[in-house]
């Protein structure tokens, strides 16, 4: 089973550059759109083009992309213009997963650590930039302070909390918040009274093939909300699951390949084989999503360089009782499925 999605061949062919010094304009105003939106193959997102004019089928991995023909955001693709240096007119859709990250337009390689400014140290991991604060200032003064302010100190990077109503501070609360001020900005502190919070995992970013699911959790040393991500594959793109629906039935809730295979990711292969379950499909307007699942760690070995492990959604069971719109549209608004949280993390 390949975690990497199979690219569809929908290559955008740009107009050739003429013997002039003007670039072809990929956006035209006023907008000129076909009367009805295109029908996209399964797993290809129907999105608004980069000109914010028309509905288009998103460009897929390896396809050409421009400011108009944009890459599939639900597959974690971005338009890499660096191959067209220095004109940057036509790019190629590249996979963010395992390749690198883009922050403020700057490309960082997978695993690269960097400081975007003096306040944060960041690392690029599988297309997600995770940052840790270098300014671990305490929380603002509480209770006695009605007007706390975060101020910049000349010559220092990190801001400090000050209280504008120091003169009105009640004497009897003088010891209440000394702990909050005790830690210097350089020391990581474990906040007491931290209410642990972990959000449900978001729906998988693709209807088929490799996608990303995220959640927010503050279960860490700083009680700091951080984004966690895992890979997900609700169903393979290259299998017609409808062919497996039993006679007289309208749905196949779970599809499971007969043989165990290795997962592949960015040219690397899982160290063991798996026989995953996938969510199936329906012939009516219902769709199937996971309702019993967990997160497993999958170890990958690469032909060159060190191996790595990734968190992956492992489906135990699916249900098919939601009314669904066009599968190309269900992620366009990034709506969560209502009322159904995964039973297991």
């Amino acid at each position: 089973t390949a975690l990497s999605p199979t690219p569809t061949t929908m290559t955008f062919t740009p107009a050739p550059l003429e013997e002039t010094t003007t670039r072809p304009e990929f956006c035209k105003w006023p907008c000129e759109c076909p009367q009805s939106p295109p029908r996209c193959p399964l797993g290809v997102s129907l999105i608004t083009d980069g000109c914010e004019c028309c509905k288009i089928c998103a460009q897929q991995l390896g396809d050409n992309c421009t400011e108009a023909a944009i890459c599939d955001p639900h597959r974690g693709l971005y338009c890499d213009y660096s191959g067209d240096r220095p004109r940057y007119a036509i790019g190629v859709c590249a996979q963010v997963v395992g390749v690198g990250c883009v922050l403020d337009g700057v490309r960082y390689t997978n695993g690269e650590s960097f400081q975007p400014n003096c306040r944060y140290n960041c690392t690029c991991i599988d297309g997600t930039v995770g940052c840790t604060p270098l300014c671990l200032s305490p929380r603002p003064p509480r209770l006695w302070c009605r007007q706390p302010r975060h101020v910049r100190v000349p010559g220092q990077c990190c801001e400090q909390w000050v209280c504008d109503d120091d003169a009105r501070r009640p004497r009897q609360t003088a010891l209440l918040d000394t702990r909050a001020f005790a830690a210097s900005g350089a020391v990581e502190q474990r906040y007491e009274n931290c209410i642990a919070y972990t959000s449900p995992w978001s729906p998988c970013s693709t209807t088929c093939g490799l996608g990303i699911s995220t959640r927010i959790s503050n279960v860490n040393a700083r009680c700091w909300p951080e984004q966690e991500s895992r890979l997900c594959n609700l169903r393979p793109c290259d299998v017609d699951i409808q062919l497996h629906i039993k006679a007289g039935k309208k749905c196949l809730a779970v599809y499971q390949p007969e043989e165990a295979t290795n997962f592949t990711l960015a040219g690397c292969v899982s160290t063991r084989t798996y026989r995953p379950k996938y969510c199936g499909v329906c012939t009516d307007n219902r769709c199937c999503i996971p309702y019993k699942s967990k997160t497993i760690s999958v170890d990958f070995q690469c032909p060159e360089g060190p191996g790595f492990s990734r968190q992956v959604l492992w489906i135990n069971a699916c249900f098919c009782n939601l009314s669904c719109r066009n599968p190309n549209d269900i992620f366009a608004d990034l709506e969560s499925y209502p009322d159904f949280e995964e039973i297991a993390n």
Partner: antibody
Framework: QVQLQQSGPGLVKPSQTLSLTCAIS??????????WNWIRQSPSRGLEWLGG?????????DYAVSVKSRITINPDTSKNQFSLQLNSVTPEDTAVYYC??????????WGQGTLVTVSS | QSVVTQPPSVSAAPGQKVTISCSGS????????VSWYQQLPGTAPKLLIY???KRPSGIPDRFSGSKSGTSATLGITGLQTGDEADYYC???????????FGTGTKVTVL
Amino acid sequence: QVQLQQSGPGLVKPSQTLSLTCAISGDTVSSNSAAWNWIRQSPSRGLEWLGGTYYRSKWYNDYAVSVKSRITINPDTSKNQFSLQLNSVTPEDTAVYYCTRSAPAAFDYWGQGTLVTVSS
Amino acid sequence: QSVVTQPPSVSAAPGQKVTISCSGSTSNIGNNYVSWYQQLPGTAPKLLIYDNNKRPSGIPDRFSGSKSGTSATLGITGLQTGDEADYYCGTSDTSLSIYVFGTGTKVTVL
């Protein structure tokens, strides 16, 4: 006619930050069909492309690997200009610095150049 | 040291023709467009040729460019004293992820 006007100090102390600005007239920094670059020239290194910034539905930066950890190129749409910041400079960064526009015709417009000397 | 090389100097009499070579590899010249720039003494470089063989408006047809495999050539016919300058080729290098310039060639009019 596109014109690029450079400004910034000609002397920078080692370990400090080199800062230059390039004001654009005759085009806009947020043009979808141009990119705005910095190139330097020294006797030891010749012409060396440092990086550029460009807008294609969103802002992108593209930096040379040799300076990637030290360089920042920022567009300023309100002033229609872009800037170069090169941190932790050494005498090896002494060069004539040019701002340039790249379009379909490669680097078709250049600033007048600024000689930046890194010395204590 | 640049990965794209040019001869350090070429010379010819007024009215003659000179050619300047620019040699690279498949990761740069072989798979990318080549541009040529003229730098008169004390001035910024000026674009002469782009996309291997195209001239921006205002550049006389005495200047021509061509590319074959991993090499490119700039030709100057009817050489004039005003053509005395340094000439640089430039191209993108996909393996180094940078835009590279050639080592430069000084043209002398005898």
